[in-house]
């Protein structure tokens, strides 16, 4: 029950953060106006991952999109491609967790599989939880130090006549969403991977025996040269040249009729 | 087409208040911040304070202050600008104001302020 | 608050003649935003409301004739009229649209020479 109630909670969880990060990649507020120096400003920039915007004093905004790949500056599509990856991580991650769900069953699939998926799924949250966590603050970072270089040169003079008053962004709405959301996500992964130790079933204390018998018996093996030439059900292709000596796969594997003496 | 229709001319004894009104049409009302300017006979424009009818927020001029209050009847699709404690210079023409880039003006509502 | 200081006050000249009018602001008027200058230009004749000739310091406005153009940047900005009609005759107002509280000029008024 509370293994279900873990699994369930990690999924909404999840969910919601996912949402979250998907919410934060699309606004347009990743970075808005400082209005420190200008309080009264008619004219309000803000900027997004995907376009940048002014709010008129007609209350009119207008938003145009980065027309440009190569132009936009690096750590920009940094910030781009992770919060992508997260997504498609996110998304892939939900769906994987959607069959793992132990309240839901599908034909006649095991808990060992269930709890496999699970612990993916969980995995991939938490991966699509950092790269989100990770995009956010590599934009933040990135609004720091532009933020400091402009106050440092905060009026650009024409000739050291005119003043120009320099904009300055400092962090958007859409970066303590993406933070936020991101921390939603890692949380609901790692209690996905919680959920997944509850959900796998107890290891069985006896393993299959296999007995060999102490001569070479490499000569009188059936398959043993379907097993060298790739042909047999041997498909690891593991050429058997020493009588008895086995690998550790073919030890653990079940024995067959041609095993016993 | 977009259009700005005002209320008509009043007369006011000083330290009373006066209410202009500005009936908009032809565009979404909450696409755009009402703003009130007005002229004062010979005198250059002079920006009063504006409304956000989306969500009512509003920004005045300093010099007004505390004398102005700028409403929007969002149903009626009509904002009302009221100016209170009125003197001899607040005679003035007062014009509603809106739509991208200032572009809409109301035909004007003359305000005497006259004891 | 913003300063625009219009010159000259009044203006004389004659139909078709080219006339230049300036507008100065105490501070820049330019967006880096969108690379604008938010400064407009109004056409105003006697007991009417004003007109809206140009935006962004030197788009004009539609349907406003294409004898007026505007130009300039961050403080200094100019509204040329390349061939003057007996309907231009009028007064010119310049405004900051970049800044609360949004100020005007105090108008260069055109008469007829």
């Known amino acids: 029950m509370a293994v279900t109630a873990c699994q369930g909670l990690g999924f909404v969880v999840s969910l919601i953060g996912i949402a979250g990060i998907i919410a934060a990649t699309c606004m347009d507020q990743w970075s808005t106006q400082d209005l420190y120096n200008n309080p009264v400003t008619a004219v309000f920039n803000y900027q997004g991952l995907w376009r940048s915007c002014v709010r008129e004093s007609s209350g009119f905004t207008e938003c145009r999109g980065y027309f440009t790949l190569l132009g936009l500056p690096a750590m920009l599509q940094a910030v781009r491609a992770l919060m992508i990856v997260g997504i498609v991580l996110g998304a892939i991650g939900l769906l994987v967790s959607i069959f793992a769900l132990k309240c839901i069953r599908i034909g006649s699939m095991e808990d060992s599989a269930k709890a496999n998926m699970t612990l993916t799924s969980g995995i991939m949250f938490i991966v699509s939880g950092l790269c989100a966590i990770a995009g956010v603050s590599v934009f933040a970072n990135m609004l720091v130090t532009n933020f400091w270089m402009s106050t440092a040169n905060m009026y650009t003079g024409m000739g050291g006549m005119v003043q120009t008053v320099q904009t300055r962004y400092t962090f958007g709405a859409a970066l303590f969403v993406g933070w936020v959301a991101g921390g939603l996500t890692l949380i609901g992964g790692v209690m996905m991977c919680i959920a997944c130790r509850g959900l796998a079933p107890e290891e069985t204390n006896y393993k299959a025996v296999s007995y060999h018998a102490s001569g070479h018996s490499v000569a009188y093996k059936p398959g043993g040269f379907k097993a060298s030439t790739g042909f047999g059900s041997n498909t690891k292709n593991k050429k058997i040249y020493d009588g008895g000596a086995r690998t550790e796969d073919e030890v653990q594997s079940y024995p067959s009729k041609h095993d016993y003496v | 087409q977009v259009q700005l229709v005002q209320s008509g001319a009043e007369v006011k004894k000083p330290g009373a208040s006066v209410k202009v009104s500005c009936k908009a049409s032809?565009?979404?009302?909450?696409?755009?911040?009402m703003h009130w300017v007005r002229q004062a006979p010979g005198q250059r424009l002079e920006w009063i304070g504006y409304i956000n009818p989306n969500n009512g927020g509003t920004s005045y001029n300093q010099k007004f202050k505390g004398r102005v209050t700028i409403t929007v009847d969002t149903s009626a699709s009509t904002a009302y600008m009221e100016l209170s404690s009125l003197r001899s210079e607040d005679t003035a023409v007062y014009y509603c104001?809106?739509?991208?880039?200032?572009?809409?003006w109301g035909q004007g509502t003359t305000v005497t302020v006259s004891s | 608050d913003i300063q625009m200081t219009q010159s000259p006050s009044s203006l004389s000249a004659s139909v078709g003649d080219r006339v230049t009018m300036t507008c100065k602001s105490s501070?820049?008027?330019?967006?880096?935003?969108?690379?604008?200058?938010?400064l407009t230009w109004y056409q105003q004749k006697p007991g009417k409301a004003p007109k809206l000739l140009i935006y962004?310091?030197?788009t004009r406005e539609s349907g406003v004739p294409s004898r007026f153009s505007g130009s300039g940047s961050g403080t200094d900005f100019t509204l040329t009229i390349s061939s003057l009609q007996p309907e231009d005759f009028a007064t010119y107002y310049c405004q900051n649209d970049y800044s609360y509280p949004l100020t005007f000029g105090g108008g260069t008024k055109l008469e007829i020479k």
């Open positions: 104001v809106t739509t991208r880039y200032l572009a809409v």
């Open positions: 962004w310091a030197s």
């Open positions: 032809g565009y979404t009302f909450t696409d755009y911040n």
């Open positions: 501070q820049s008027l330019f967006n880096s935003g969108n690379q604008k200058n938010y």
